[in-house]
């Protein structure tokens, strides 16, 4: 039940996160005109990944797309790429996770397949979230750099007679939406990965496989754990990473294809 809840919650959180990443990518307010310490203008500038806009005091807003591809800064192209990769991975992850949901029955799909799909979607969500966070952070870094550069030469004058105020840009709403959305997608992915462990059938967990020799039995535990002899009370060693209370001997009586690595 807890596994289903974790998986379901992971899916919902990731869904919200990806919706947020899509929204952030489409938003025009990645950078907005800095109003602090500036003359009061009757024009407000803001820019997105795809177009720049000007809102006039009259109430009119004019937006212009970036119709060039080669003329755009490499950083902007990189941010676009990161956000698109994030969206694509997230969308595929959502598609995979829908079929992986424990509450959805598709034919005679085995729990092991569902576990694998859950893990796959979880990894996809994590990468998607990281892409979004990276994209937004790169853009934010670009803004900070440009902000201080334009502050350094805030006023560029012609012979000291005429002052031209440079428009400085600061963080827009889309950056915060992107950070939060990326974080949610990342959290959702982690939850899916956690759910995967609980989803896997009992046999898929790391089990100690006992190889019975002629004189005595030795249980070899994978993963570098100390091998224990099969004499006396040691033959009742509890297996590692198992939610149940079965012993090695009990496992041996239910062989499956997963027992032999």
């Amino acid at each position: 039940m807890a596994v289903t809840a974790c998986q379901g919650l992971g899916f919902v959180v990731s869904l919200i996160g990806i919706a947020g990443i899509i929204a952030a990518t489409c938003m025009d307010q990645w950078s907005t005109q800095d109003l602090y310490n500036n003359p009061v203008t009757a024009v407000f500038n803001y820019q997105g990944l795809w177009r720049s806009c000007v809102r006039e005091s009259s109430g009119f807003t004019e937006c212009r797309g970036y119709f060039t591809l080669l003329g755009l800064p490499a950083m902007l192209q990189a941010v676009r790429a990161l956000m698109i990769v994030g969206i694509v991975l997230g969308a595929i992850g959502l598609l995979v996770s829908i079929f992986a949901l424990k509450c959805i029955r598709i034919g005679s799909m085995e729990d092991s397949a569902k576990a694998n799909m859950t893990l796959t979607s979880g990894i996809m969500f994590i990468v998607s979230g990281l892409c979004a966070i990276a994209g937004v952070s790169v853009f934010a870094n670009m803004l900070v750099t440009n902000f201080w550069m334009s502050t350094a030469n805030m006023y560029t004058g012609m012979g000291g007679m005429v002052q031209t105020v440079q428009t400085r840009y600061t963080f827009g709403a889309a950056l915060f939406v992107g950070w939060v959305a990326g974080g949610l997608t990342l959290i959702g992915g982690v939850m899916m990965c956690i759910a995967c462990r609980g989803l896997a059938p009992e046999e898929t967990n790391y089990k100690a496989v006992s190889y019975h020799a002629s004189g005595h039995s030795v249980a070899y535990k994978p993963g570098g754990f100390k091998a224990s002899t099969g004499f006396g009370s040691n033959t009742k060693n509890k297996k590692i990473y198992d939610g149940g209370a079965r012993t090695e001997d009990e496992v041996q009586s239910y062989p499956s294809k997963h027992d032999y690595v």
Epitope: Q33, P39, V40, T41, A42, V43, N45, Y46, Q47, S52, C53, V54, E56, S57, S58, G59, F60, E62, R64, V162, Q163, T164, V165, Q166, T167
Partner: antibody, heavy 118, light 113 residues
Framework: DVQLVESGGGLVQPGGSRKLSCTAS????????MNWVRQAPEKGLEWVAF????????HYLDTVKGRFTISRDNPKNTLFLQMTSLRSEDTAMYYC???????????WGQGTSVIVSS | DIVMTQSPSSLTVTAGEKVTMSCKSS????????????LTWYQQKPGQPPKLLIY???TRESGVPDRFTGSGSGTYFTLTISSVQAADLAVYYC?????????FGSGTKLEIK
């Protein structure tokens, strides 16, 4: 057809008050920023105050700040200018204007005259 | 506040002549976001309210005759009337539409001989 009609002008004593109104028609009033512009006799144009379509942004000329209040009633398509502590230098023809593309004032009313005199 | 300086203060020309008047602003009116200059020209005929002629420094308002041309960028702007007509007798004002408070130039009075 866009129309702006000002009213409320007249003779006022120094220190007195007056409320000017501007009734708009022929356009979606709440979508446009509006201004009051004045012109003293035989003088040039002087912008007085601005109010955005949703009344969330307001700006005033420094010399009228604290004395004049611009407001609007969008359902009634009306713009107001409440003037208090009037001075002789406030004597002018007051025009109501609509702000359009490029922040240009594309429509002007015929104006209402305010005379501040004892 | 932005200071708008218009010159000359008055002009007397004969009908059919070409006339140019200038307007200087104390700060650039060019908006980097859309590369537009927020400067407007108005015409005020005697006893009438002003009329919009040109916005964005060079965009003619609909219904304005094409003999009126606006040009310039940054801090220096001009209004040119290619062939003055008797109907053009008026005072012409330039206005800063970029910074609050909006400021007008003192005007150029155009008189016909």
């Amino acid at each position: 057809d866009v129309q702006l009609v000002e009213s409320g002008g007249g003779l006022v004593q120094p220190g007195g008050s007056r409320k000017l109104s501007c009734t708009a028609s022929g356009f979606t009033f709440n979508s446009f920023g509006m201004n009051w512009v004045r012109q003293a006799p035989e003088k040039g144009l002087e912008w007085v105050a601005f109010i955005s379509g949703g009344s969330n942004t307001i700006h005033y000329l420094d010399t009228v700040k604290g004395r004049f209040t611009i407001s609007r009633d969008n359902p009634k398509n009306t713009l107001f200018l409440q003037m208090t502590s009037l001075r002789s230098e406030d004597t002018a023809m007051y025009y109501c204007t609509r702000l359009a593309l490029g922040n240009a004032m594309d429509y002007w009313g015929q104006g209402t005259s305010v005379i501040v005199s004892s | 506040d932005i200071v708008m300086t218009q010159s000359p203060s008055s002009l007397t020309v004969t009908a059919g002549e070409k006339v140019t008047m200038s307007c200087k602003s104390s700060q650039s009116l060019l908006n980097s976001g859309n590369q537009k200059n927020y400067l407007t020209w108005y015409q005020q005929k005697p006893g009438q309210p002003p009329k919009l002629l040109i916005y964005w420094a060079s965009t003619r308002e609909s219904g304005v005759p094409d003999r009126f041309t606006g040009s310039g960028s940054g801090t220096y702007f001009t209004l040119t009337i290619s062939s003055v007509q008797a109907a053009d007798l008026a005072v012409y004002y330039c206005q800063n539409d970029y910074y609050f408070p909006f400021t007008f130039g003192s005007g150029t009075k155009l008189e016909i001989k």
